[in-house]
Interface confidence: medium
């Protein structure tokens, strides 16, 4: 995977990790999560130009076919390649519990 | 994962498996693949409206934040959830070889 500095569209415009600050209200979690009150959500955002961070052979195929039929075949999309775990303190009937979520915060990104 | 018939945008418009016929020339493979001459490429195409085939918690977060900040946070994207293997007969210096690719054809789809 090439790094974000290789982006042919200009610095920072290609698929990479971004952080978006979100409150429990933003996420619709206010009624079942106690803590944290705010989450630094890491997610994958940006363009996937030809062969940039291509995840696999499928992504390469998608790039080729998108060029031939842009109205039919979508370009590859910037999505998480792996995740960081996050612990949420949740409300329960009996009080609170700690729950680890393995698929909540993107760790790094690729195009697929 | 809900099936494609639940698509709120109309039948067949949401994230689902499509087949696109492609020749070796279309894929740019003519110089290194002998067979098959044509590939039925299965790929994931379609919209990902709210919570449709959400792959995980991250996809749910993305949906929430996209609604709040559509210019900043993209909607979830329709990508393969798993793949079917495919065997290609390749040209080599000494003749031909059979190579199995595990990440070439999408098997089913989800939104992430």
């Amino acid at each position: 995977a090439r790094n974000g500095d290789d982006c042919p569209l200009g610095p920072g415009r290609c698929c990479r990790l971004h952080t978006v600050r979100a409150s429990l209200e933003d996420l619709g979690w206010a009624d079942w999560v106690l803590s944290p009150r705010e989450v630094q959500v890491t997610m994958c955002i940006g363009a996937c130009p030809s062969q940039f961070r291509a995840a696999n052979m499928h992504a390469q195929i998608k790039t080729s076919l998108h060029r031939l039929k842009p109205d039919t075949v979508p370009a590859p999309c910037c999505v998480p390649a792996s995740y960081n775990p996050m612990v949420l303190i949740q409300k329960t009937d009996t009080g609170v519990s700690l729950q680890t979520y393995d698929d909540l915060l993107a760790k790094d990104c690729h195009c697929i | 994962a809900r099936n494609g018939d639940d698509c709120p945008l109309g039948p067949g418009r949401c994230c689902r498996l499509h087949t696109v016929r492609a020749s070796l020339e279309d894929l740019g493979w003519a110089d290194w693949v002998l067979s098959p001459r044509e590939v039925q490429v299965t790929m994931c195409i379609g919209a990902c409206p709210s919570q449709f085939r959400a792959a995980n918690m991250h996809a749910q977060i993305k949906t929430s934040l996209h609604r709040l900040k559509p210019d900043t946070v993209p909607a979830p994207c329709c990508v393969p959830a798993s793949y079917n293997p495919m065997v290609l007969i390749q040209k080599t210096d000494t003749g031909v070889s059979l190579q199995t690719y595990d990440d070439l054809l999408a098997k089913d789809c989800h939104c992430i």
Partner: antibody, heavy 119, light 111 residues
Framework: QVTLKESGPGILQSSQTLSLTCSFS??????????VSWIRQPSGKGLEWLAH???????RYNPSLESRLTISKDTSRNQVFLKITSVDTTDTATYYC???????????WGQGTTLTVSS | DVVMTQTPLSLPVSLGDQASISCRSS???????????LEWYLQKPGQSPKLLIY???NRLSGVPDRFSGSGSGTDSTLKISRVEAEDLGVYYC????????FGGGTKLEIK
């Protein structure tokens, strides 16, 4: 060089079927990425995209007219065809064919053929 | 379907002036690879349309550099830096990212 030329009946009566032919040279519809579209323009009005056929016989239609349109091709004769059923006076227009190359844009157009539908 | 709205409908200019035509799409026509399949065509009186600009800002070979395209997301603009007599006609934007659609056209004419 690339050229495209449209031909058609010129005049039709309402409810008849329109058959148009686009004859082209300078490229082949067997080449990956190539396609041909039909586009029409009523006199003094704007352009309306009708249909597109890809090199692999994949077809696209304007959804508002899809039930009346059929696009086809004869690759060996370098021709693309369009049929429009049940024409009426609103189909009176100049009909163009245009080549859609890589990434979809129309780099070459025919000079157009005029159709008048009389009631 | 994507609706392409062009403004203005008519643009009276003096020769040598700059001209600017806007095209707005009803939804984003940006693909996730950064491509936007947005084109500009010029149709001179009695002629077929001719491609000027493709992928928002790329000039077709042979098109004078006084023509430039820009834009992102749903908004695109065609600028002509110094209008010449041969530039007069109707300009159309077109998107090929979704079901293909043309804008309604903008007539560039002498003031």
């Amino acid at each position: 060089q690339v050229t495209l030329k449209e031909s058609g009946p010129g005049i039709l009566q309402s409810s008849q079927t329109l058959s148009l032919t686009c004859s082209f040279s300078g490229f082949s519809l067997s080449t990956s990425g190539m396609g041909v579209s039909w586009i029409r323009q009523p006199s003094g009005k704007g352009l309306e995209w009708l249909a597109h056929i890809y090199w692999d016989d994949d077809k696209r239609y304007n959804p508002s007219l899809e039930s009346r349109l059929t696009i086809s091709k004869d690759t060996s004769r370098n021709q693309v065809f369009l049929k429009i059923t049940s024409v009426d006076t609103t189909d009176t227009a100049t009909y163009y064919c245009a080549r859609g190359g890589y990434d979809g844009y129309y780099d070459y157009w025919g000079q157009g053929t005029t159709l008048t539908v009389s009631s | 379907d994507v609706v392409m709205t062009q403004t203005p409908l008519s643009l009276p200019v003096s020769l040598g002036d700059q001209a600017s035509i806007s095209c707005r799409s009803s939804q984003s026509i940006v693909h996730s690879n950064g491509n936007t399949n947005l084109e500009w065509y010029l149709q001179k009186p009695g002629q077929s349309p001719k491609l000027l600009i493709y992928k928002v800002s790329n000039r077709l070979s042979g098109v004078p550099d006084r023509f430039s395209g820009s834009g992102s997301g749903t908004d695109s603009t065609l600028k002509i830096s110094r209008v010449e007599a041969e530039d007069l006609g109707v300009y159309y934007c077109f998107q090929g990212s979704h079901v293909r659609t043309f804008g309604g056209g903008t007539k560039l004419e002498i003031k």
